[in-house]
């Protein structure tokens, strides 16, 4: 068997809502994966499990089952959404995300994804981890790859 390649492309969109009373942020983050089947037979993408972390705390999980079949030497682009919640001991981020005086409301999230594929009864798992910027201050649609993580520092003006 030849390889099945999984490439995490990035965040496609992030839709944000708030609970003012609970100082809670809800972020629905849609991610894009490219899965390439380098074999001369079809493989089934059985499931995708995803997890999102902020500052080493898991803020969201998702699992998709029986997703698709990828034909021989074919590639499919798959979107999956992870609902995340920033609350409780992380609720200080509510102010960072909502204060108008703050001009940039990006936070760095770690996206973890595991793809399980099967062919001829054989199962294979491929995992990826990526740091991504997500805007927690407004609904955002990203160009693919636009949310890749970099780093610079400045104080609130």
């Amino acid at each position: 068997p030849r390889s099945i390649d999984v490439k995490y492309i990035g965040v496609k969109s992030a839709y944000v809502s708030y609970d003012v009373q609970k100082r809670t942020i809800y972020l629905n983050i849609t991610n894009t994966l490219n899965i390439t089947n380098n074999n001369y037979y079809s493989v089934e993408v059985e499931n995708i499990t995803a997890q999102v972390q902020f500052s080493k705390t898991v803020i969201g999980k998702a699992r998709l089952n029986n997703i698709t079949i990828i034909g021989p030497l074919d590639m499919k682009q798959i979107d999956y959404t992870v609902p995340t919640v920033i609350a409780e001991e992380m609720s200080y981020m509510y102010d960072f995300c909502t204060l108008i005086s703050i001009k940039v409301h990006n936070i760095v999230l770690m996206m973890q994804v595991t793809v399980t594929t099967t062919y001829f009864g054989h199962s294979e798992q491929i995992s990826q981890e990526r740091y991504q910027y997500v805007d927690c201050g407004r609904n955002t649609t990203y160009q693919l790859g636009q949310s890749e993580y970099l780093n610079v520092l400045q104080p609130q003006q």
Epitope: E89, M90, F96, L99, I100, N151, V152, L153, P155
Partner: antibody
Framework: EVQLQQSGPELVKPGASVKIPCKAS????????MDWVKQSPGKSLEWIGH????????FYNQKFKGKATLTVDKSSSTAYMELRSLTSEDSAVYYC??????????????????WGQGTSVTVSS | DVQITQSPSYLAASPGETITINCRAS??????LAWYQEKPGKTNKLLIY???TLQSGIPSRFSGSGSGTDFTLTISSLEPEDFAMYYC?????????FGGGTKLEIK
């Protein structure tokens, strides 16, 4: 120049309440959140809670829920902390402090960048 | 709550010396630690934020390092005005918590 001006020392009786003001100047009051900190005699610092002057939203250290109430008056750029049902355990110096968020491309943390001079509260009959 | 253990609680040194103060968190707090200086009759002063970034207007003899659970404040070439109380504070998760403080005195 950023300043947080607190009121003078308070001597209060057990069971009573006290309301400590913290008047902000030198910056736009609603641009920053405000934290409150307790320092008991000979002890370290304890974080009481935090208020966002825009919407009055608060978050309290569980230990101080029911003891402290944080409010703001935007018109006078003043934050307040009310302490109720006072006991000798509440005798301490109380500080207000401006919380600043640091960011570049993304969130990079925060800190209390300006502090009030502290208000001493003594609970005694 | 995240416990912060600060050491030493007391330190005697001479002007010109270099000293270090340590803070250890009970769990990882990433880089989210600040250092403050407390002096009688003055308002508390922010020295370092995000573990290692020097606050504007603070002399470069102050430096911070560390991430995760272990952090250090270093003051090189101590000046007479540096003798004070020092506190660290984590802001990775609510409630914010402080170290027990270090009293730096002249030897």
């Amino acid at each position: 120049e950023v300043q947080l001006q607190q009121s003078g020392p308070e001597l209060v009786k057990p069971g009573a309440s006290v309301k400590i003001p913290c008047k902000a100047s030198g910056y736009t009051f609603t641009d920053y959140t405000m934290d409150w900190v307790k320092q008991s005699p000979g002890k370290s610092l304890e974080w009481i809670g935090h208020i966002n002057p825009n919407d009055g939203g608060t978050f309290y250290n569980q230990k101080f829920k029911g003891k402290a109430t944080l409010t703001v008056d935007k018109s006078s750029s003043t934050a307040y902390m009310e302490l109720r049902s006072l006991t000798s355990e509440d005798s301490a110096v109380y500080y207000c402090a401006r919380w600043v968020y640091y960011y570049g491309i993304s969130y990079e943390g925060g800190a209390m960048d300006y502090w009030g001079q502290g208000t001493s509260v003594t609970v005694s009959s | 709550d995240v416990q912060i253990t600060q050491s030493p609680s007391y330190l005697a040194a001479s002007p010109g010396e270099t000293i270090t103060i340590n803070c250890r968190a009970s769990k990882s707090i990433s880089k989210y630690l600040a250092w403050y200086q407390e002096k009688p009759g003055k308002t508390n002063k922010l020295l370092i934020y995000s573990g290692s970034t020097l606050q504007s207007g603070i002399p470069s003899r102050f430096s911070g390092s560390g991430s995760g659970t272990d952090f250090t404040l270093t003051i090189s070439s101590l000046e007479p005005e540096d003798f004070a109380m020092y506190y660290c504070q984590q802001h990775n998760e609510y409630p914010w918590t402080f170290g027990g403080g270090t009293k730096l005195e002249i030897k």
